[in-house]
Each structure stands twice: as C-alpha cells, then as structure tokens.
C-alpha cells in the first residue's frame, strides 16, 4: 500500500539536491582557497540535519544553528552588497567588482542559491515531489527559514557603508515584505553601519526620472533614519553601462551619471 504523502503547493526538492550541495561546496572551496580546509561532507551533514525528519512547516532558526557555526566566514564587513528583486545584476556586479560580496558570494549562500529542499516528519526521506509554498502553505519552511537566518546574520555582520541594489522597474522599488525589507534592513547594526546607500536600477532606456524620489524609497529612508543610520540614494540609469564602467573605470565615457 503506498504511504500517504503530504502534498504541498510548492515545487519539490531540487533533483540531486545532496549531490548538488556537496559539489557546490567542493567547488567553492576550490575557488576560495581561504576556505580550503572546510570539510564539505560535514557541511552537508549539518545542512541535512536542519530539515531531515522534521515537519517542513515547523522549521526554526534553531534547526540551522549547527550549520550557522560555519557561517563565520570572514567577508569584509564594509564590502557588503545587499539586493532586492534584482539578483542577477547584483551577482554580475560582484563578479566584476571582486572585493564586494552578496550573500550568495559566501559559502552558505552559494550552496543554497536557487535550490529548493524539504523533508518529511519522522522519515529520513527528502521530498522531491512538493515542498511548502511560503504563501499558500507556511512561512516556517526549510528554504524560507534558511534564507531568513543567513540574511539576518549577513546584515548583522555589515559595517561602514552598506550598499543595496534595488529594482527600479518594480511597482514597489522598496518592498517591506522582501527579505531585504523584512529582515536585512532591521538587522543592520547602527553602532557599526554608518550609511545605507541604495542604487536604484532603471529598466527603461529612456527613463530619466529620479527614482530616488519614489515614495517607497522615501519609506526606506525613513526606516533607516529612525535606526540612526544615514541614507543615500543613486540612480543607475544605464545598468549595462554601469557594469561596463565597473569593468573599465578609465573609459572616458564613464561619467558620474550612468
């Protein structure tokens, strides 16, 4: 008799999830020799321990604490780039500007980027059929809790000037419900962080509006100011040009307004 299995609304665990996490870990330690001594099998064991045999709607930050013990990777605290709804450009930027880091440039972020995972209560099986959707099923699912935990720690580690890339093409350029708006903003430490600098990325080629005046940006400024952190904002009118100028800052066409 086939055993009854909970059907969730979201996609199931990414296929070959254990192999993917292990392979990513090994690759990361090869790319980042400062992490050469990390034992990726132990990392996977801790990752697995956070969600295997646990109800996928009952995951807590505590479940990830063993894995977070590895999260002491020393990213320069003044070189942190946060992002919201514009991941690809943020990652393209840090690939060029190698001394700046998004969460996905750290080991834990790199391991989990774009993956889905969940287990089942009281069995050691990984659920490849379906996993809880944040809206339709529950927010305390393995993936959401993971990102909330690592995002909080990443924001807490930041210092000096913190940059955030925001998508100017969205109706809410700053969204209070995004990970940035609900977790990272509130975990920047005022005693360490002097300024949050927002980069608003324009989508349209002919879009010359000052999106730093957008009501949601003003809302972000208000939240940040109340936390005793200074706020500044820049329009990035031409993201393609922006990246090109990061690659070749000496280019004569690279003026301050991009």
């Amino acid at each position: 008799v086939p055993r009854w299995r909970q059907q969730w609304s979201g996609p199931g665990t990414t296929k070959r999830f254990p192999e993917t996490v292990l392979a990513r870990c090994v690759k990361y330690t090869e790319i980042h020799p400062e992490m050469r001594h990390v034992d990726c099998q132990s990392v996977w064991d801790a990752f697995k321990g956070a969600f295997i045999s646990k109800h996928p709607c009952n995951i807590t930050e505590e479940d990830y604490q063993p894995l977070m013990k590895l999260g002491t990777q020393t990213v320069p605290c003044n070189k942190i780039l946060l992002w919201s709804r514009i991941k690809d450009l943020a990652h393209q930027f840090t690939q060029v500007q190698r001394d700046m880091f998004t969460l996905e440039d750290t080991l834990l972020g790199y391991l989990a980027d774009d993956l889905t995972w969940c287990g089942e209560f009281n069995t050691s099986k990984i659920n490849y059929q379906s996993c809880p959707d944040w809206r339709k099923d529950c927010s305390n699912n393995p993936v959401s809790v993971f990102w909330k935990t690592v995002s909080r720690r990443f924001a807490e580690a930041a210092c000096d000037v913190v940059h955030v890339m925001l998508n100017g093409s969205r109706s809410k350029i700053f969204d209070k419900n995004s990970t940035f708006g609900s977790v990272e903003v509130h975990n920047l430490q005022p005693e360490k962080v002097q300024t949050l600098e927002a980069w608003v990325i324009h989508g349209g080629r002919e879009d010359s509006r000052d999106l730093c005046q957008d009501p949601t940006i003003k809302e972000l400024e208000s939240i940040i100011s109340k936390r005793n952190i200074q706020f500044s904002c820049k329009n990035i009118y031409r993201p393609d040009k922006f990246l090109q100028c990061v690659k070749n800052p000496e280019d004569s066409s690279c003026t301050s307004e991009i």
Partner: antibody, heavy 118, light 110 residues
Amino acid sequence: QVQLVESGGGLVKPGGSLRLSCAASGFTFSDDYMSWIRQAPGKGLEWVASVSNGRPTTYYADSVRGRFTISRDNAKNSLYLQMNSLRAEDTAVYYCAREGWSGEFTDWGQGTLVTVSS
Amino acid sequence: QSVLTQPPSASGTSGQRVTISCSGSSSNIGFHFVYWYQHLPGTAPKLLIYKNNQRPSGVPDRFSGSKSGNSASLAISGLRSEDEADYYCAAWDDSLSGYVFGSGTKVTVL
C-alpha cells in the same frame, strides 16, 4: 624535490627583534600558502602564522598578533617572519611549512632555534 | 591548554593496533579537515593523514584516520619500533581564524 631551509634564528634579549627567513625550492613557490609553526622546548607544535598566495592575506595566532609579521617574496622564493617585542615564551624551534590544497602542511623545513633570554 | 585534546601517551607491543583520539568542537574538527603529523625528536614533522583519512604517497597503509562529529582518531595497525614518535592532530579553527594543534600523543612500542 621540495626543500625548505630556515635561517636567522639565534639568541636575542626580551623586547628584541629577529627576522627569520625560509628559502624554498623544488615547487612553484608563488602558488602555495606558506606558514610558520613553532615548538617550544618540551612542548607541542603551535601554529604561528600563514600567508596566502596571490595578493597576500595574512593570518596570525593570538599569541603573536601585533608583534610578528609574516611576508613573502615570490621573486626570491622566500618566506619571512619578522619578530618584534620578543618574549621568553617565544623561545622555540621555528619551522617553515608549505601548505597543500586542503590546508595540510605537506612539507616542513628542519627548523631554526630562537632563544629569547637575558 | 590545547584547543584539541589528545591523550598524552599511548603504547602497544610490536604488531598491535594503537588508536589515538583527538577531540575538538564544531569550530574546528566539526566543519574542517583533520590532519595528523608524526614528529620524531630532532627531525622535521611529517604529514601522515590529510582530509580526515587520506594518506600522502609514501605513508604506509598501517596508518589510517577517521572523523566523526567533533572528534577524530588515528589508528596505527601492525605497530613497529620505528613508529615510536609524537603524533599531533590539527585542524583549522573558525573562531580563532587559524590552525590549532592537539597537545600531542607520545607513542611507545613496548
């Protein structure tokens, strides 16, 4: 084959300075992390400092941070340890070691003795 | 006081199996590779085991390493007189941002 030869050890008074050198051969020196490890008389091994390849990043044990400086000269295939504000407890044999791809110390020199005494 | 804990001594007769333990924490052994070194007085230390259980070429298969959780062990089977030496475990420690060694175990062949 791989050879690591330390030099520069000797007797120095407390508060004094000394510079150790390690001449490397038999491998592509610039490719590898390098380290200094010491052993005080009658004691165990103690890691002192490491320096990365490429644009060098340095790492130090708490016991020497701020007093010792590790550096390298890839053109000369040489590793150095500048030791300032020396204390009696720094008395030890100092080994130069090459690190492997997984962080292990694959090759070691024969060591040079540093004695800090008045 | 070493961050990694080893027994001060271990002994066995020729041909016997001796095991040396090394106990640490999640900030070192837990998430990092364990290395084992053999040190004979007056000589340079020698790498015996890396990545928990890998032997460099030239190290006899009588030496084997293992790791479980926050602990590791080195086993020497078919003990020989030339195995008399000090043995050290080591690992990277995240909280110290550096390598840590065990206090060393003196192996005696009776």
